[in-house]
């Protein structure tokens, strides 16, 4: 099946202090390689979460990515702050034999818009 990375929401709004879920699904797990979430693009992009076991404060996976045939790579960001605003991308990589993993597909991005906490 052709690989497609889908981020169904163009944007989400969240009040500061709340949590938000950023959805991402894949149509195929092939080729073999990790899925990572970034905020921003190009040289200024920031790694937000990687489904490879590292610990990322405030960010967790929504479903069990270790389950066989799991195609859901959504994440939850907790205790959102204004600094979390930006566009988030779910990116699929192909594992290289020795060289670094190659970025092969990306979701269309989900903008996180942080609203002031209601007083």
């Amino acid at each position: 099946k052709e690989l497609k990375v889908t981020q169904p929401e163009k944007s989400v709004s969240v009040a500061a202090g709340d949590s938000t879920v950023l959805n991402c699904t894949l149509t195929s797990l092939l080729p073999v390689g990790p899925i990572k979430w970034y905020r921003g693009v190009g040289q200024s992009r920031l790694l937000i979460y990687s489904f490879t076991g590292e610990h990322f404060p405030r960010v967790t996976n929504v479903s069990d990515a270790t389950k066989r045939n799991n195609m859901d790579f959504s994440i939850r960001i907790s205790n959102v702050t204004p600094e979390d605003a930006g566009t988030y991308y779910c990116v699929k990589f192909q594992k290289g034999p020795s060289e670094p993993d190659t970025e092969i597909q990306s979701g269309g991005g989900t903008e996180v818009y942080v609203l002031a906490k209601p007083s």
């Epitope: 169904p8 163009k10 944007s11 693009v41 990306s106 269309g108 991005g109 903008e111 818009y113």
Partner: antibody, heavy 119, light 108 residues
Framework: DVQLVESGGGVVRPGESLRLSCAAS????????MNWVRQAPGEGLEWVSL????????YYADSVKGRFTISRDNSKNTLYLQMNSLRAEDTAVYYC????????????WGLGALVTVSS | ETVLTQSPGTLTLSPGERTTLTCRAS??????LAWYQEKPGQAPRLLIY???SRATGIPDRFSGSGSGTEFTLTISSLQSEDFAVYYC??????????FGGGTKVEIK
């Protein structure tokens, strides 16, 4: 049929204000994000601002931030652009554009409203 | 922000000719790219989205291709109504949404 009709354009002096309106019909207005895009004489297209269907999420181009305000009245199927502190470089045809429901490209445009800022 | 560069700036062609317009992005936008046609006194019209998908009602003489940073719009046989200005737009890196500077296709 989708229709977008801009109004409110005209000639103003630098520093003055103007409000553009865009009357929408032929689709469920409140379900779609809407944008303003402008084109200065002899120049290309420049994105100005966007507002989500609910009105909760708003973005502006740096060139108009702090001077322009986008808003919408879903009960009237109308999009607005309040333009304050107008400058000569704001002279352009302003288009109202409806977004696709999944991605931020524009599937329908209005004919545009001409704004001329001149002393 | 992602800068889009369109080339050439102007094309002077005859009806029936085939032409290819190019749009280059300063960084990868994958296939998140659209093409529009603009004619004087008319609303801009969406031609292509997703780099290669034709919008509703667009004739099949228009085709788009490319991914990453290099994209093309091809008109297989120019009709009189195709003489216009064409713009590409990326919707991957945002905000802001950015457009190319446009390519004018004029009649010889």
């Amino acid at each position: 049929d989708v229709q977008l009709v801009e109004s409110g354009g005209g000639v103003v002096r630098p520093g003055e204000s103007l409000r553009l309106s865009c009357a929408a019909s032929g689709f469920t207005f409140s379900s779609y994000d809407m944008n303003w895009v402008r084109q200065a004489p002899g120049e290309g297209l420049e994105w100005v601002s966007l507002i989500s269907g609910s009105g909760e999420i708003i973005y502006y181009a740096d060139s108009v931030k702090g001077r322009f305000t986008i808003s919408r009245d879903n009960s009237k199927n109308t999009l607005y652009l309040q333009m304050n502190s107008l400058r000569a470089e704001d002279t352009a045809v302003y288009y109202c554009a409806k977004e696709d429901n999944r991605y931020r490209f524009f599937d329908y445009w209005g004919l545009g409203a001409l704004v001329t800022v001149s002393s | 922000e992602t800068v889009l560069t369109q080339s050439p700036g102007t094309l002077t062609l005859s009806p029936g000719e085939r032409t290819t317009l190019t749009c280059r992005a300063s960084q990868s936008v994958y296939t998140y790219l659209a093409w529009y046609q603009e004619k004087p006194g008319q609303a801009p019209r969406l031609l292509i989205y997703g780099a290669s998908s034709r919008a509703t009602g667009i004739p099949d003489r228009f085709s788009g291709s490319g991914s990453g940073t290099e994209f093309t719009l091809t008109i297989s046989s120019l009709q009189s109504e195709d003489f216009a200005v064409y713009y590409c737009q990326q919707y991957y890196d945002r905000p802001p949404l950015t457009f190319g500077g446009g390519t004018k296709v004029e009649i010889k």
